[in-house]
């Protein structure tokens, strides 16, 4: 009786079970009653990452520098190339097909989490007692200067965008 299902790493064709090609190889010809499945290794810059019956290998992903991309991990016959973004940029999607410049945190906001090649900068508002007076992708909120520790007094209150201004204490005449 011809089989209706095949073992793992096999496929059914012409009423018989043929071996799939291993990762890194493509199908040249199906098996017969006399020959096994014929497979050939993928060429340079090609890959197949599963047991397969593909007649063509996939092209390695191109990390286009014009899109801010660079190679993070070179592809093999069994794996695709992994792209990442140039310094100061991050991927727009999980597939990392293009990059955008890291977001900067505006004055009044500080960096909660610095951006990576795959995630953008996370900003947070500066709470009371902290400030940020620059637009930056790296700067956290800084604490207001403590005038007391400098034996000074607050002459101008701080905000989320400005530090306090300290001045000398009024002396008793």
């Amino acid at each position: 009786e011809p089989p209706t299902a095949c073992r793992e790493k096999q496929y059914l064709i012409n009423s018989q079970c043929c071996s799939l090609c291993q990762p890194g190889q493509k199908l040249v010809s199906d098996c017969t009653e006399f020959t096994e499945t014929e497979c050939l290794p993928c060429g340079e810059s090609e890959f197949l990452d599963t047991w397969n019956r593909e007649t063509h290998c996939h092209q390695h992903k191109y990390c286009d520098p014009n899109l801010g991309l660079r190679v993070q991990q070179k592809g093999t016959s069994e794996t695709d190339t992994i792209c990442t973004c140039e310094e100061g940029w991050h991927c727009t999607s999980e597939a990392c097909e293009s990059c955008v410049l890291h977001r900067s945190c505006s004055p009044g906001f500080g960096v909660k989490q610095i951006a990576t090649g795959v995630s953008d900068t996370i900003c947070e508002p500066c709470p009371v007692g902290f400030f940020s007076n620059v637009s930056s992708a790296f700067e956290k909120c800084h604490p207001w200067t403590s005038c007391e520790t400098k034996d000074l007094v607050v002459q101008q209150a701080g905000t989320n965008k400005t530090d306090v201004v300290c001045g000398p204490q009024d002396r008793l005449r």
Epitope: V28, S29, C31, T32, E33, F34, T35, E36
Partner: antibody
């Protein structure tokens, strides 16, 4: 018991034709691919032709393609090899073989074909 | 076409000795190789399939190994009936091809 019995061999002149037969018994003939393999006197084995179990697919090496034809009659449990335009280099013992697990798991006793003028 | 080269052409050994026969393929054939034995005046018989799988009814002293391009048939201890010619055959792709054979003769 699996049995393969070849017949039809003999002496033939170059350019002439000959038809070999192989009578199969002891197994379900229609379930198996079949092949012909030959062996020139004192030489090694050479694959000549193969045919799928249903008879739809046939396979030949380049040196016999267009001259030899493999066929089968599943109702008669018989395999054939029609050999045309015979040459001196076709002189050999011709074996009928069964394809089991992609191997030639059973062989006939062989029939001698001599191509000579 | 895949060319199979067997070595040595002739192996002269005594009964009880170990025989090691080699078959080399011109390109990788994975484990798609069979071994056959042919005694004088007889038809070939299948000994090993898929490079290393034993065949029912074949004595355990016959074993096969190898994958890719290099294959070995080993007869652990030669019996008088083992003196014969041994052929390898590839079934990785068309055309099916055989090695030229190794003759194991009595020393």
């Amino acid at each position: 018991e699996v049995q393969l019995v070849e017949s039809g061999g003999g002496v033939v002149q170059p350019g002439r034709s000959l038809r070999l037969s192989c009578a199969a018994s002891g197994f379900t003939f229609s379930n198996y691919g079949m092949s012909w393999v030959r062996q020139a006197p004192g030489k090694g084995l050479e694959w000549v032709a193969s045919i799928s179990s249903g008879g739809d697919d046939t396979y030949y090496p380049d040196n016999v393609k267009g001259r030899f034809t493999i066929s089968r009659d599943n109702s008669k449990n018989t395999l054939y090899l029609q050999m045309n335009s015979l040459r001196a280099e076709d002189t050999a013992v011709y074996y009928c073989t069964r394809a089991g697990g992609k191997a030639m798991d059973y062989w006939g006793q062989g029939t001698l074909v001599t191509v000579s003028s | 076409e895949i060319v199979l080269t067997q070595s040595p052409a002739t192996l002269s050994l005594s009964p009880g000795e170990r025989a090691t026969l080699s078959c080399r393929a011109s390109q990788s054939i994975r484990d798609n190789l069979h071994w056959y034995q042919q005694k004088p005046g007889q038809s070939p018989r299948l000994l090993i399939n898929y490079a290393s799988q034993s065949i029912s009814g074949i004595p355990a002293r016959f074993s096969g190994s190898g994958s890719g391009t290099d294959f070995t048939l080993t007869i652990s201890s030669l019996e008088p009936e083992d003196f014969a010619v041994y052929f390898c055959q590839q079934f990785n792709s068309w055309p099916l091809t055989f090695g030229q054979g190794t003759k194991v003769e009595i020393k």
